[in-house]
């Protein structure tokens, strides 16, 4: 009896794992084995596919074959008993195009109100993704084990920290990888669960802000208790993208080590141009807090976002304010590459009641003022880009007296 060729051959590639599956064409025939050949583009001869010769099952693995994953290949299969079936040719394919991204490895660390997630590609030193290792982004789904309400977090890198969680609570999550450059979305990892710890005695510092004063950066934060010491660390932001490396060498800012105030000042030249992460930790000598939320700090944006400089022309019932480019040391104006919004605060010198004007223009009228009254004005700049969302510090206050009642010009 003639053997029939196997049918319905499927090629599954996940990371560097190449799996073939097929259907027996004739279930009634026993002791049949199957063998594959492959052919590279531009070659006439067929080569035996190692790992897929004389297979008794309907599945084989040819991961050991060292293929150029960007090169098209063709496969063929036949059944063998005493005689052989005709060859059945599988549509040619390019491994890289066909490949799926496998589930990533996930490593979790617990704090009282945060979880640190370290993500690594599922296959270490993968051949398939060798050129794309740094292009992986990840997304995750997280939920409280008790509620099951899911939250999705997109576009994260190989280290991500989730804040504002509840202490002593079990959270579960799953992660998948994506290669957006190749329109590939991966397979979810298994579900990983971790319980946050009991609440720490000392909370982490909050509301960290960086501003520029003269040639220095000023880092400020809020803290609940007095008589604490603080330390500040920085890390190059790009290191969070580094796949497989989970040793993050956070560095001390020398002028911000063991400071006793909720701010520290350090020279701008501590940082070269770039994007950094900053974090702050508190200690009372016996206990240490967990690290604060990490803030992104872009020297380019921070450097340009100096407080605005302005002139006031005083009338009887209003001020005309003309906003100019801020001056750096040496009295040279700073070129603003970003569209800015200006926040102007003014108040009567004898009162604490502040009023606010938000304006995109650089000439602003402050209306409804009383004649012959001293008003003070301060201003700051904000970036209009939501992603950057930076603000300068306020300028020094400038105080001027309005003109007598009869002058309106």
């Amino acid at each position: 009896k003639n053997l029939k060729s196997p049918q319905k051959v499927e090629v599954d590639i996940i990371d560097d794992n190449f799996i073939l599956r097929w259907n027996r064409s004739d279930e009634s025939v026993g002791n049949v084995t199957f063998s594959f050949d492959y052919q590279k583009t531009g070659m006439d001869n067929w080569i035996k596919l190692s790992g897929c010769q004389n297979i008794t099952s309907t599945k084989c693995n040819f991961s050991s074959l060292k293929l150029n994953v960007y090169e098209e290949i063709k496969l063929r299969i036949r059944a063998e008993k005493e005689n052989t079936s005709s060859w059945y040719e599988v549509d040619s394919f390019t491994p890289f195009r066909k490949a799926q991204i496998g589930p990533p490895e996930v490593h979790l660390e617990a704090e009282d109100k945060a979880i640190v997630i370290h993500i690594s590609p599922g296959t270490k030193d993968s051949v398939m993704w060798a050129l794309d290792g740094l292009s992986f982004t990840y997304s995750l789904v997280i939920w409280k084990n008790s509620s099951g309400v899911e939250e999705r977090i997109e576009n994260i890198y190989s280290r991500h920290k989730i804040y504002k969680l509840s202490p002593e609570t079990t959270y579960c999550l799953k992660v998948k990888a994506a290669l957006l450059t190749s329109w590939k979305i991966g397979v979810y990892s298994p579900v990983h669960c971790i319980k946050t710890t009991v609440e720490n005695e000392l909370p982490p510092p909050e509301n960290i802000e960086v501003s520029v004063q003269n040639q220095n950066y000023v880092l400020k934060w809020d803290y609940t208790y007095a008589n604490m010491t603080f330390q500040v660390q920085w890390l190059h932001a790009f290191l969070k993208r580094n796949p497989g490396n989970h040793l993050y060498k956070w560095k001390q800012i020398p002028d911000c080590e063991n400071v006793k105030t909720t701010q520290c000042v350090f020279p701008q030249n501590v940082f070269q141009k770039g994007i950094y992460l900053l974090r702050v930790q508190a200690s009372d000598g016996n206990n240490t807090s967990f690290w604060s939320e990490e803030i992104k700090f872009d020297t380019e944006i921070q450097a340009f976002l100096l407080p605005p400089v302005f002139n006031i022309r005083s009338l009887s019932d209003s001020f005309h304010i003309y906003i100019g480019a801020p001056k750096q040391s040496g009295n040279t104006p700073v070129i603003q590459d970003y569209p800015l919004i200006y926040e102007i605060i003014f108040w009567e010198n004898t009162s604490n009641a502040e009023r606010k004007i938000i304006e995109k223009k650089t000439d602003v009228t402050v209306p409804n003022l009383k004649p012959l009254t001293v008003y003070c004005v301060k201003a700051r700049a904000h970036t209009m880009d939501e992603k950057l969302n930076k603000s300068s510090v306020f300028s020094d206050a400038v105080c001027e007296k309005t003109k007598p009642g009869n002058t309106s010009k």
Epitope: H107, L108, E109, A110, E111, D112, H118, I194, T197, V198, N200, E201, N245, H246, L247, K249, K251, Q252, Q281, S283, N286, N287, T288, F290
Partner: antibody
Framework: EVQLQQSGAELVKPGASVKLSCTAS????????MHWVKQRTEQGLEWIGR????????KYAPKFQGKATMTADTSSNTAYLQLGSLTSEDAAVYYC???????????WGQGTSVTVSS | DIVMTQSQKFMSTSVGDRVSVTCKAS??????VAWYQQKSGQSPKALIY???YRYSGVPDRFTGSGSGTDFTLTISNLQSEDLADYLC?????????FGGGTKLEIK
């Protein structure tokens, strides 16, 4: 294969100083932290400190500040521990260890025994 | 400094036993705890990191658990080659500190 080869046993006089070495193979020390740990006979482990060989940044346990000095030479892939003004309290086995992923000491040298005797 | 306390200096055990070695931190250290095994005359060997992750090559009879201040290393079906000193270590903050160790002995 990752290996840390430490220098041989030292017999030193009280008041003298000694420099121990730890040569790494199978990895580049500048990509890791290098730790030093002390163990006195029949006692537990004491963390001395760690160095980032990439830039020389060090952290010491307060107890060893002024006693120990850690350095590293990335060209020879070697970390060093210098101990000064030695007393009988400093007699111990000193281990170097690699600080790897998640900050853990994942590989250890075989240890160097330091004896202080006049 | 954070103090890591291993209250049992010695534990009498038998081959096949399930043994739990405990370690208590003087403050919340999250999951920043590692466990090491040290056999007589040898260097320490890392077994567990981040409180519960096993190093590759470490038999799955070794399990780490705990977070915050209380940590446990459990050895199920104890083998004769497991007789050693077991030390916990915190790396939450400097200086990193070790527990005093727990020595497993045969009854």
């Amino acid at each position: 294969e990752v290996q840390l080869q430490q220098s041989g046993a030292e017999l030193v006089k009280p008041g003298a100083s000694v420099k121990l070495s730890c040569t790494a193979s199978g990895f580049n020390i500048k990509d890791y932290y290098m730790h030093w740990v002390k163990q006195r006979t029949e006692q537990g482990l004491e963390w001395i400190g760690r160095i980032d060989p990439d830039d020389g940044e060090t952290k010491y346990a307060p107890k060893f500040q002024g006693k120990a000095t850690m350095t590293a030479d990335t060209s020879s892939n070697t970390a060093y521990l210098q101990l000064g003004s030695l007393t009988s309290e400093d007699a111990a086995v000193y281990y170097c260890a690699r600080g790897g992923n998640y900050y853990v000491m994942d590989n250890w040298g075989q240890g160097t025994s330091v004896t202080v005797s006049s | 400094d954070i103090v890591m306390t291993q209250s049992q200096k010695f534990m009498s055990t038998s081959v096949g036993d399930r043994v739990s070695v405990t370690c208590k931190a003087s403050q919340n250290v999250g999951t920043n705890v590692a466990w090491y095994q040290q056999k007589s005359g040898q260097s320490p060997k890392a077994l567990i990191y981040t409180a519960s992750y096993r190093y590759s090559g470490v038999p799955d009879r070794f399990t780490g658990s705990g977070s915050g201040t209380d940590f446990t290393l459990t050895i199920s079906n104890l083998q004769s080659e497991d007789l050693a000193d077991y030390l916990c270590q915190q790396y939450f903050s400097y200086p990193h500190t070790f527990g005093g160790g727990t020595k497993l002995e045969i009854k």
